[in-house]
C-alpha cells in the first residue's frame, strides 16, 4: 500500500474549503477538501439533504 504524505494546507489556501478541512496532499501536489457532514463538491461548496422516505404500507 502506497503511503500518502499529507499536511495542513498553507495560509495561501485560506477559504479554499467552504465547509470542510483543507488537506495538502504533498506527493500529488494538490489541496483536498475533507467535507463536513452534509456538504459535497471539490471545495465542499454544495449542501445536500438526505431525504428519508416514510415506510410504505406493505412494510407496516
Amino acid at each position: 500500500v502506497a503511503q500518502v504524505s499529507i499536511t495542513k494546507c498553507s495560509s495561501d489556501m485560506n477559504g479554499y474549503c467552504l465547509h470542510g478541512q483543507c488537506i495538502y496532499l504533498v506527493d500529488m501536489s494538490q489541496n483536498y477538501c475533507r467535507c463536513e457532514v452534509g456538504y459535497t463538491g471539490v471545495r465542499c461548496e454544495h449542501f445536500f439533504l438526505t431525504v428519508h422516505q416514510p415506510l410504505s404500507k406493505e412494510y407496516v
Epitope: 498553507s10 495561501d12 489556501m13 495538502y24 501536489s29 494538490q30 489541496n31 471539490v42 471545495r43 461548496e45
Partner: antibody, heavy 116, light 106 residues
Framework: QDQLVQSGAEVKKPGASVKVSCKAS????????IQWVRQAPGQGLEWMGR????????KYVPKFQGRVTITADTSTNTAYMELSSLRSEDTAVYYC?????????WGQGTLVTVSS | DIQMTQSPSSLSASVGDRVTITCKAS??????IAWYQQKPGQAPRLLIQ???TLQPGVPSRFSGSGSGTDYTFTISSLQPEDIATYYC????????FGGGTKVEIK
C-alpha cells in the same frame, strides 16, 4: 487535458488599459484559485494577485492595488486581468496560473508592450 | 508581506559541479516553498514543491531542503541542459518569488 489558454499579444499606449483573458479547459475554474504573475523583459517573476472564481474574492499585491482588477466569468470558464494607467515599465509577459486542485499550472503567457 | 531573498543572483559552474542556491524568507514559511526552472522564451517549469518534493519527470539530481526561514536548492551534478534561471516561490501566505539565480556553464 487541462489547459489555460491566454489571449494574444497587445500593444498599448501609455495611460491606456489592457485586459488579458485566460480561458480554462478540462477543468472548472470554480474548483481553483487563478493567480496572475508577470515578467518584464530580462527581469524576474512578480506575483500580482489572485481571484477565487467561486465567490469573486480577490487579493492584490499593494504595489498594484487600485490599478489592477482581476475578474472571472464562470459561465465561460475564463479569468481576466485588467491593468490600467499603463506605463513603459508595465511591458511584460503576463501569466495566469491555476492553483488549488493542482499545484501551479501555468498558461502560455501574454506579451503586453507599452509604447508611445 | 513575506519577502524572499535569493542568492546568488548569478553563478558560473562547470559540468558535473554541485550547485547550491539559497532563499531566505522574512518570516517562517512552514516549508511552503517551491522551486522553478525557466529557460529563455519559456514559461517557468515547476521542479520542487513543499521544500523537497520532486515533480514527476524531474531528474533526481535536483533536490531541496530547509525549514523555518532558510531553504536550499541543489543540483548535485550540473548538466548542460540545466542552464537556466531558477526561482524560489513562497506560498505560505499569498505568494512571493525570489529574485532569481542565473546559472551558466564555465
Amino acid at each position: 487535458q487541462d489547459q489555460l489558454v491566454q489571449s494574444g499579444a497587445e500593444v498599448k499606449k501609455p495611460g491606456a488599459s489592457v485586459k488579458v483573458s485566460c480561458k480554462a479547459s478540462g477543468f472548472n475554474i470554480k474548483a481553483t484559485y487563478i493567480q496572475w504573475v508577470r515578467q518584464a523583459p530580462g527581469q524576474g517573476l512578480e506575483w500580482m494577485g489572485r481571484i477565487d472564481p467561486l465567490n469573486g474574492n480577490t487579493k492584490y499585491v499593494p504595489k498594484f492595488q487600485g490599478r489592477v482588477t482581476i475578474t472571472a466569468d464562470t459561465s465561460t470558464n475564463t479569468a481576466y486581468m485588467e491593468l490600467s494607467s499603463l506605463r513603459s515599465e508595465d511591458t511584460a509577459v503576463y501569466y495566469c496560473v491555476r492553483s488549488g486542485t493542482l499545484f501551479d499550472f501555468w498558461g502560455q503567457g501574454t506579451l503586453v508592450t507599452v509604447s508611445s | 508581506d513575506i519577502q524572499m531573498t535569493q542568492s546568488p543572483s548569478s553563478l558560473s559552474a562547470s559540468v558535473g559541479d554541485r550547485v547550491t542556491i539559497t532563499c531566505k524568507a522574512s518570516q517562517d514559511i512552514h516549508k511552503y516553498i517551491a522551486w522553478y526552472q525557466q529557460k529563455p522564451g519559456q514559461a517557468p517549469r515547476l521542479l520542487i514543491q513543499y521544500t523537497s518534493t520532486l515533480q514527476p519527470g524531474v531528474p533526481s539530481r535536483f533536490s531541496g531542503s530547509g525549514s523555518g526561514t532558510d531553504y536550499t536548492f541543489t543540483i548535485s551534478s550540473l548538466q548542460p541542459e540545466d542552464i537556466a534561471t531558477y526561482y524560489c516561490l513562497q506560498y505560505d501566505n499569498l505568494r512571493t518569488f525570489g529574485g532569481g539565480t542565473k546559472v551558466e556553464i564555465k
